[in-house]
Amino acid sequence: LEVQVPEDPVVALVGTDATLCCSFSPEPGFSLAQLNLIWQLTDTKQLVHSFAEGQDQGSAYANRTALFPDLLAQGNASLRLQRVRVADEGSFTCFVSIRDFGSAAVSLQVAAPYSKPSMTLEPNKDLRPGDTVTITCSSYQGYPEAEVFWQDGQGVPLTGNVTTSQMANEQGLFDVHSILRVVLGANGTYSCLVRNPVLQQDAHSSVTITPQRSPTGAVEVQVPEDPVVALVGTDATLRCSFSPEPGFSLAQLNLIWQLTDTKQLVHSFTEGRDQGSAYANRTALFPDLLAQGNASLRLQRVRVADEGSFTCFVSIRDFGSAAVSLQVAAPYSKPSMTLEPNKDLRPGDTVTITCSSYRGYPEAEVFWQDGQGVPLTGNVTTSQMANEQGLFDVHSVLRVVLGANGTYSCLVRNPVLQQDAHGSVTITGQPMTFPPEA
């Protein structure tokens, strides 16, 4: 006997009635006296509702279920579940037996929309740029668990420093509280979106914070104009300074270093304390110099991946910020030179000279010249590839027709360090082998 139920879960709002559809195809001459219909919980096999011996045997499920008696004879074995609760969620099996037997399971997915979020700020007065504030977004009485997203006024997602908690209330519905910790800019809008993943329902709220500005004007924050160049593996100092007023104490200072583009926290000093590194424990401040206005950041064991812009935010009574660029560099090794073919060379032969230099950064500029210093630009192919640390290995290939004799030089330049690494090979007129045999 073929029993049909919907493939997709039946979605029901808490407090409403839900129909769990189930149908079979009655044969000609079918009568209800022949029908045995049982609804039960799929997992525990507990009875929910039944029809047997030509009669509705009633609900075994807190009197909240009903069949559709007028439709049974047409093969409609659906079950009505009233005043749906969270606890009803799950799979229900419809067993139908006439002469033969069939069954199928249908899932009930319970849902409840989340309320419009309420937003609170802590602290909520005397806010100044550079202050760290906690924004709480609360939404209530939803089901199932919510997905919570934060974004700024430009729609840029805010993923760092978010803590979201969800707790079931007495009806099993969830109250969600999401906390975002941010450093205030000159002003800003922060939006919280609470999504019910089943209903695809979004509940939004936002708060715009316009911090007070002190009459004295912004804190002037100074950083170097030019990028800070740091060698891979060394420590780099990203310089940042401000001018403390007389009577300034570190208790008044909020200092935040963050990535300029993604706004992710790198290091902070707040509430009179160094809050430590959020950057893989590779950053440090200069605690003894902070009181004199030195907010510089030390970045240890520089990697290629650290390259980019870092912003220094300083807030005392007022606020200022500036961005400093870190340019990572690594010198190229002295080039090694190879020839192909490398023996029995004669004038007029075409040879391929390869110049290889390793572990530099950023990409090299490669120049070839002959023994008279004349640039060789034709038939040169240069390729560069990042190695396991992100440093570049450069291979430059020159194809030349040998003259009576000749010197071919390769120069690998690091454009950031203005460092040149040279290699050369001299090929004499008589038949020879490279490298020359001792």
Epitope: T262, V304, A305
Partner: antibody, heavy 120, light 107 residues
Framework: QGQMQQSGAELVKPGASVRLSCKTS????????ISWLKQKPGQSLEWIAW????????SYNQKFTGKAQLTVDTSSSTAYMQFSSLTTEDSAIYYC?????????????WGAGTTVTVSS | DIVMTQSHKFMSTSVGDRVSITCKAS??????VAWYQQKPGQSPKLLIY???YRYTGVPDHFTVSGSGTDFTFTISSVQAEDLAVYYC?????????FGGGTKLEIK
Amino acid sequence: QGQMQQSGAELVKPGASVRLSCKTSGFTFSSFYISWLKQKPGQSLEWIAWIYAGPGYTSYNQKFTGKAQLTVDTSSSTAYMQFSSLTTEDSAIYYCARHVGRQRGYFDVWGAGTTVTVSS
Amino acid sequence: DIVMTQSHKFMSTSVGDRVSITCKASQDVSTAVAWYQQKPGQSPKLLIYSASYRYTGVPDHFTVSGSGTDFTFTISSVQAEDLAVYYCQQHYSTPWTFGGGTKLEIK
């Protein structure tokens, strides 16, 4: 020069979630950024997000915010992408790929891709 | 978002021909453009990045020109193994975006 080994094909139902993995070898995991990209059959590529294993930083394409969540396990040099609330529109090949930095968003080493099919 | 437009979805060519694929950015991306080759059933392969840097192992019959908004990828003498889809990508600002692709076919 580095390898990225992705988990096998997935067949999932609408509304479900899927977690894709990308195990890396042959390079220093914490020295590179790992991005995830989407390609529907016969179509172009879309960048989803990057993660930098060092400090665990992430950056998402706004289109995929809330849909994708990136994590890493540095002990096994593996990157993960959790893709949630799947619809048939999410049926695609998903690639992981590495890049040198957040200012260098070109991808020099790619995984072979994981095919995700969303169907009821 | 920056839109990268490859005007030709398909290009027919013969082995030995010179072929150029164009890519236009909706705003200035300086030289932050990469080019990839993708063959059926394979992941994309990086060919050129930052407008002019050749990735290791990439043949020298692939060249690129342009900066700002207009870029051209040229294959000086098409080989049978070059038949594939070619994508341009801007790596100037996130979200990084790709062109729609140009499929190189044999006439």
